[in-house]
């Protein structure tokens, strides 16, 4: 089969594609982000980076491929760069920046039922225990109906 995909040029901000093998069918382009601590992920059509809900766990993507139909897969327009996870998950401090499904809710550090010390300690220190450092993990005991009154966020 012959032909090639068009040069992927309408990229979302901070996304970079490297296509060492060109754009022929079967060629792969590596995805990366200009910001060193961001990761390339696929978002649904109606979701932007600015309004990703904490419960959304987008799929990481490392490459796109030129298909036989001369289309890139996944489509580059669906690939975005999001803040990566800081390497402080499961260390007994609830890091606001990691309190999202994509970072496994900071490894359990933001819920009384899952943090090892059984006391949520926020970081930054001013992080609101009812806001960015709240217990958001839907799997935590705090969110099972029978235990709703059994745990506090403090």
């Amino acid at each position: 089969m012959q032909g090639q995909c068009s040069v992927p040029n309408e990229l979302n901000s901070n996304l970079k594609l490297q296509c060492p093998d060109g754009y022929a069918i079967g060629s792969e382009c590596a995805t990366s982000c200009l910001d060193h601590n961001s990761e390339s992920i696929i978002l649904p059509m109606n979701v932007t980076v600015r309004d990703i809900p904490h419960w959304l766990n987008p799929t990481r993507v490392e490459r796109v491929v030129c298909t036989a139909g001369l289309k890139w897969y996944p489509h580059p327009a669906l690939i975005h760069c999001v803040k990566g996870c800081e390497p402080f998950m499961g260390d007994n401090y609830c890091d606001a920046i990691n309190n999202r499904a994509f970072c496994n809710y900071d490894g359990g550090d933001c819920c009384t039922s899952t943090v090892k010390t059984k006391k949520v300690t926020p970081f930054p220190m001013s992080c609101d225990l009812q806001g960015d450092c709240a217990c958001r993990d839907p799997q935590a005991q705090e969110h099972s109906r029978k235990d709703l009154r059994g745990y506090s966020h403090g």
Partner: antibody, heavy 119, light 107 residues
Framework: EVQLVQSGAEVKKPGESLKISCKGS????????TGWVRQAPGKGLEWMGI????????RYSPSFQGQVTISADKSISTAYLQWSSLKASDTAVYYC????????????WGQGTMVTVSS | EIVMTQSPATLSVSPGERATLSCRAS??????LAWYQQKPGQAPRLLIY???TRATGIPARFSGSGSGTEFTLTISSLQSEDFAVYYC?????????FGGGTKVEIK
């Protein structure tokens, strides 16, 4: 008057152990976290770690993890910084500083403890 | 870790003049930025927190601005007691990091 009073200057040999202290007074110790900051001679400030008032959870900057131990005894309103085996590169002034639990910035600092490590 | 870069390393200013110090973060820290003043043989003193809020007892000639990655400390009219080293610090992402400092000296 709110104060953080640190223990006095120390001169040690490489390989020796050391524990320096920071005693808080004039405020409720359990309403504040305590941080430790290093300043090597002629150099800038380096954040070492913090401890919350319960004394059970300390958090270390990666470059100090495993090199020092931060602890606290809330019954005597005192935080500690200790080394099990000092190195010449540990020579520095060490400051303790306190911050309110819902604040990210230390509002009161100790006077500093000079630690000299030399053979 | 987030790297904080201060410029210039040394600033020579005459008393009464305006001093502008810069601090750049390697990634966004929102408005989580503090400025400290340190004089020889003394502990640092908090001047500004959350980017632009003056700490208790700090004179109005000190002001902070900026957010994200670019921050500025301005001293509107330098007094003799303002000659010191100034550090910026971010407490947004662990580890907390300081800039290398800017020394403000008499011209």
């Amino acid at each position: 008057e709110v104060q953080l009073v640190q223990s006095g200057a120390e001169v040690k040999k490489p390989g020796e152990s050391l524990k320096i202290s920071c005693k808080g007074s004039g405020y409720s110790f359990t309403s504040y976290w305590t941080g430790w900051v290093r300043q090597a001679p002629g150099k800038g400030l380096e954040w070492m770690g913090i401890i919350y008032p319960g004394g059970s959870v300390a958090r270390y900057s990666p470059s100090f993890q495993g090199q020092v131990t931060i602890s606290a005894d809330k019954s005597i309103s005192t935080a500690y910084l200790q080394w099990s085996s000092l190195k010449a590169s540990d020579t520095a002034v060490y400051y303790c500083a306190r911050g309110p639990l819902r604040s990210d910035y230390p509002d009161v600092w100790g006077q500093g403890t000079m630690v000299t490590v030399s053979s | 870790e987030i790297v904080m870069t201060q410029s210039p390393a040394t600033l020579s200013v005459s008393p009464g003049e305006r001093a502008t110090l810069s601090c750049r973060a390697s990634q966004s820290v929102g408005s989580y930025l503090a400025w400290y003043q340190q004089k020889p043989g003394q502990a640092p003193r908090l001047l500004i927190y959350r980017g632009s809020t003056r700490a208790t007892g700090i004179p109005a000639r000190f002001s902070g601005s900026g957010s994200g990655t670019e921050f500025t400390l301005t001293i509107s009219s330098l007094q003799s007691e303002d000659f010191a080293v100034y550090y910026c610090q971010q407490p947004y992402v662990w580890p907390i990091t300081f800039g290398g400092g800017t020394k403000v000296e008499i011209k």
